[in-house]
Amino acid sequence: LQDPCSNCPAGTFCDNNRNQICSPCPPNSFSSAGGQRTCDICRQCKGVFRTRKECSSTSNAECDCTPGFHCLGAGCSMCEQDCKQGQELTKKGCKDCCFGTFNDQKRGICRPWTNCSLDGKSVLVNGTKERDVVCGPSPADLSPGASSVTPPAPAREPGHSPQ
């Protein structure tokens, strides 16, 4: 015998108390599949959450975060405060990255600069709070005659024409 509830479409619930008729989900609730005996209460995007997608009778609302915050967790279950680049969020708020670390995003933690010497390379561009160091060729590669990097042209003295 087929379960009579299997005929109830998404957006309805199968009402055991009314001879298993299909009743529509009330406002602010939904059922995303057929044959359900209950409707799920819609998520409400309140406070720091804002509605990205309204709830319908067949699908839940989706939330994101108000400006200055970003989503964390599955389905944006939490909103976390943004910080500036070069900072990380601590229990006491946004704090600048310590020397030797950087963060190039508005979220996440400060990470240590790359240690170029571990790869046998030299530092081409120093790191900042916002940016990692840029590693260049190894010091051996910079020996005369072996360099693959064109050395910068010497600066010209003002008022002199090239010789």
Partner: nanobody, 120 residues
């Protein structure tokens, strides 16, 4: 931590009315369906009804003597019981869930209950 507190129970005579209240502390009812269950001595728990978003769903034992309503300002849900009968004697529990109706659902939270006795 959510706490649900029922009140309004007591001993009444057949044919009388009672209004039970369910108040929530620690959280509002805003995002929950609120249900009522009852359990008579030596019997299984019985579903009374569920309220959500202006709609009420009732158990199959009773169609028109019981009415569930809600006062958003007071964060309270009510169970109005009219023309009470001796077989309505039970402990009445308020519960909340993210499901509607709660007829086949294990609630997320449930109160301690309030005793209703109907006796002449």
């Amino acid at each position: 931590e959510v706490q649900l507190v029922e009140s309004g129970g007591g001993t009444v005579q057949p044919g009388d009315s009672l209004r039970l209240s369910c108040a929530a502390s620690g959280r509002t009812f805003d995002n929950y369906a609120v249900g009522w269950f009852r359990q008579a001595p030596g019997k299984e728990r019985q579903y009374v009804g569920t309220y959500w978003s202006g709609y009420a769903h009732y158990g199959d034992f009773e169609n028109n003597r019981f009415t569930i309503s809600r006062d958003n300002a007071k964060n309270t849900v009510y169970l109005q019981m009219d023309n009470l009968k001796p077989e309505d004697t039970a402990v009445y529990y308020c519960a909340i869930s993210l499901k509607y109706p709660m007829a086949t659902v294990t609630p997320d939270y449930q109160g301690q209950g309030t005793q209703v006795t109907v006796s002449s």
